[in-house]
């Protein structure tokens, strides 16, 4: 099949003891091979500070996955989700202020 770029969506959980869990979800992409990582200041976070979901079929012939990490409240601007898929790449910020999600479809 032809390449289908991922839809990337970044969400924040409620604050807990000064921390926020940020989750980056990639969905509706093909083929299944993808790189998804959280970055701080443009640098990929350590493997053991991130949690990854499996790359799973989403029922439409495409795939979905996610990566999450915990960050300090107030430092959201330092963190971005980085995605590579089929030669394309993109960065996705943590939503600021009262906004709780951000999504973008790559072309």
């Amino acid at each position: 099949g032809s390449t289908v770029p991922p839809m990337v969506n970044v969400t924040c959980s409620e604050v807990s003891e000064g921390n926020i869990t940020v989750t980056c979800r990639a969905s509706s992409f093909y083929p299944r091979n993808i790189t998804l990582t959280w970055r701080q200041d443009g640098v990929s976070l350590s493997h053991n500070t991130q949690q990854w979901g499996d790359v799973l079929p989403d029922g439409n012939g495409t795939y979905q996955t996610w990566v999450a990490t915990r960050i300090r409240q107030g430092e959201e601007q330092r963190f971005t989700c980085y995605m590579e898929h089929s030669g394309n790449h993109g960065t996705h910020p943590v939503p600021s202020g009262n906004s709780h999600h951000h999504h973008h479809h790559h072309h």
Partner: antibody, heavy 116, light 107 residues
Framework: VQLQESGPGLVKPSQSLSLTCNVT?????????WNWIRQFPGNKLEWIGY???????TYNPSLKSRVSITRDTSKNQFFLQLNSVTPEDTATYYC??????????WGLGTSVTVSS | DIQMTQTPSSLSASLGDRVTISCRAN??????LNWYQQKPDGAVKLLIY???RIHSGVPSRFSGSGSGTDYSLTIANLEQEDVATYFC?????????FGGGTKVEIK
């Protein structure tokens, strides 16, 4: 992307070492982390710290009490200040860009000797 | 800090030889392992990042592999321009640390 270090080649003990990294071909406010690394005589490399594209800094804990990294966004430069230097700080100092997993562009380095 | 042990510290090989340099971490670094080349004039270049990804513009004779604590850099057909010192770097656990270097010379 090009990086070029500059600064005095000789610093006296107990004084401060100040170096400049001039970046061309990419804005230091665009993305990534902008680093200082040093190489001692004998080739050992040590990461000193970085200033991120947002202006946030992260330092090697072994040097944190003596180091400061700042920037001038109008000139697309970032700076290293290392205080209370001793002869053990004699090294070649490099600046480099850290993109995602690795430092993909480095300056040519500038040699600094600490001696009275 | 994570300690990175590189072997050998120096080697001499003939043009066209296959050369392998090893790097061992004292704990799992989850593929966050990079290789750099430093020419005799001091210039440093990234060769391989994230264990096996080749940096743009790097000749295909360079390759990287490994997992867990053990990693390697291979030069498939040694050329004169490969005379240099090679360093590994782990980026999984702050602060990032480097191996002691391997000096490669031509017989």
């Amino acid at each position: 992307v090009q990086l070029q270090e500059s600064g005095p080649g000789l610093v006296k003990p107990s004084q401060s070492l100040s170096l400049t990294c001039n970046v061309t071909g990419y804005s230091i406010t665009g993305d990534y982390a902008w680093n200082w690394i040093r190489q001692f005589p004998g080739n050992k490399l040590e990461w000193i710290g970085y200033i991120g594209y947002t202006g946030s800094t992260t330092y090697n804990p072994s040097l944190k009490s003596r180091v400061s990294i700042t920037r001038d966004t109008s000139k697309n430069q970032f700076f290293l200040q290392l205080n209370s230097v001793t002869p053990e700080d004699t090294a070649t100092y490099y600046c480099a860009r850290w993109r995602n997993w690795a430092m993909d562009y480095w300056g040519l380095g500038t040699s600094v000797t600490v001696s009275s | 800090d994570i300690q990175m042990t590189q072997t050998p510290s120096s080697l001499s090989a003939s043009l066209g030889d296959r050369v392998t340099i090893s790097c061992r971490a004292n704990q799992d670094i989850s593929h966050y392992l990079n290789w750099y080349q430093q020419k005799p004039d001091g210039a440093v270049k990234l060769l391989i990042y994230y264990t096996s990804r080749i940096h743009s513009g790097v000749p295909s004779r360079f390759s990287g592999s490994g997992s867990g604590t053990d990693y390697s850099l291979t030069i498939a057909n040694l050329e004169q321009e490969d005379v240099a010192t090679y360093f590994c770097q782990q980026g999984n656990t702050p602060p990032t640390t480097f191996g002691g270097g391997t000096k490669v010379e031509i017989k």
